[in-house]
């Protein structure tokens, strides 16, 4: 397909990516599915500059990002390497806390009210941010 030169309506362009900020809450998996149906993914934070951009738009509200450890190690949904990548956890996080009484630990990452990250129960209905790269957004997948 022809290269997309701008973001879809209601999305915000920043540094060759498009971002969509929800104003309602969903469980992490449902938020992830919403982004994927928009040919996007939950936001992957790769720099302090991107962190500040997202933080500015979401405000002091718990908001899901595309980072989870539901299958063991922490992973970004787009395959970005976690170990060598940008991190902005709150002190003593992630802690996989079991004391919430909801069963299991905490496997999904979110921005907290100060922007730093925390792991939490994936079923909590938090706001979320979708991201898609402009160049990637322009390409049609091969036909089946």
């Amino acid at each position: 397909g022809s290269e997309r030169t701008c973001c879809p309506v209601n999305w915000v362009e920043h540094e060759r990516s498009c971002y969509w900020f929800s104003r309602s809450g969903k469980a992490w998996a449902d938020a992830d599915n919403y982004c994927r149906l928009e040919d996007a993914h939950l936001v992957v934070v790769t720099s302090w500059e991107e962190q500040k951009f997202v933080q500015h738009h979401i405000g002091p509200v718990n908001t899901w990002m595309g980072l989870h450890d539901q299958n063991g190690p922490w992973k970004w949904v787009d395959g970005t390497d976690y170990e060598t990548g940008f991190k902005n956890w709150r002190p003593e996080q992630p802690d996989d806390w079991y004391g919430h009484g909801l069963g299991g630990g905490e496997d999904c990452a979110h921005f907290t009210d100060d922007g730093r990250w925390n792991d939490d129960v994936c079923q909590r209905p938090y706001r979320w941010v979708c991201e898609t790269e402009l160049d990637k957004a322009s390409q049609e997948p091969p036909l089946l």
Partner: antibody, heavy 121, light 107 residues
Framework: EVQLLESGGGLAQPGGSLRLSCAAS????????MSWVRQAPGKGLEWVSV????????YYADSVKGRFTISRDNSKNTLYLQMNSLRAEDTAVYYC??????????????WGQGTLVTVSS | DIQMTQSPSSVSASVGDRVTITCRAS??????LAWFQQKPGKAPQLLIY???SLQSGVPSRFSGSGSGTDFSLTISSLQPEDFATYYC?????????FGQGTKVEIK
């Protein structure tokens, strides 16, 4: 004017295959998720599958997973449903439906007229 | 899966009547709910999305309300063209699921 026109329905044997098509017009097809929804005779509506605008992401109801495949050709403004290993319980009118993203969910805002699939020996 | 339960399954009413149909989700779905109207032999038509937003072109006598698990569709003054089957549908999580339908019949 949005138009969705399904085709490809008909009679199939149990275990057989059919391929449904949905020709779309009146909107920028590649920009919207598209779904298939079915309705067995005299019964209610059942969502079958959905595909994202560029085709990279698909989801299925458990009842058809592994047997049905949704796909699209954005150069032809056409949605497809490949139906394999058909069962009697797949007998239904199959509708294609355009999706619209509103505030964090997708809704079916336009529907085709439907095509009848009958699975019988 | 989220089960959607509509009540009543059918209702008899007269032109001009106020009719309310309810829909209950087996778990909370916030306001991620749609209502559809279907006439015999025709495709469904979107009436309400996001629980209470009226789809473009739909008469204002239709209204939706609710959040969480309990929702309703109200027709403020039933018109002859409103006799049909109505379905609710949750759009919160996969698989997307519909209620079993409510048939609005002429009394």
């Amino acid at each position: 004017e949005v138009q969705l026109l399904e085709s490809g329905g008909g009679l199939a044997q149990p275990g057989g295959s059919l391929r449904l098509s949905c020709a779309a017009s009146g909107f920028t097809f590649r920009s919207y998720a598209m779904s298939w929804v079915r309705q067995a005779p005299g019964k209610g509506l059942e969502w079958v599958s959905v595909i994202s605008g560029r085709g990279g992401n698909t989801y299925y109801a458990d009842s058809v997973k592994g047997r049905f495949t949704i796909s699209r050709d954005n150069s032809k403004n056409t949605l497809y449903l490949q139906m394999n290993s058909l069962r009697a319980e797949d007998t239904a009118v199959y509708y294609c439906a355009k999706g619209i993203a509103v505030a964090g969910s997708h809704y079916f805002d336009y529907w085709g007229q439907g095509t009848l699939v009958t699975v019988s020996s | 899966d989220i089960q959607m339960t509509q009540s009543p399954s059918s209702v008899s009413a007269s032109v001009g009547d106020r009719v309310t149909i309810t829909c209950r989700a087996s778990q909370g779905i916030s306001n991620w709910l749609a209502w559809f109207q279907q006439k015999p032999g025709k495709a469904p038509q979107l009436l309400i999305y996001a629980a209470s937003s009226l789809q473009s072109g739909v008469p204002s006598r239709f209204s939706g309300s609710g959040s969480g698990t309990d929702f309703s569709l109200t027709i403020s003054s039933l018109q002859p063209e409103d006799f049909a089957t109505y379905y609710c549908q949750q759009a919160n999580s996969f698989p997307w699921t519909f209620g079993q339908g409510t048939k609005v019949e002429i009394k």
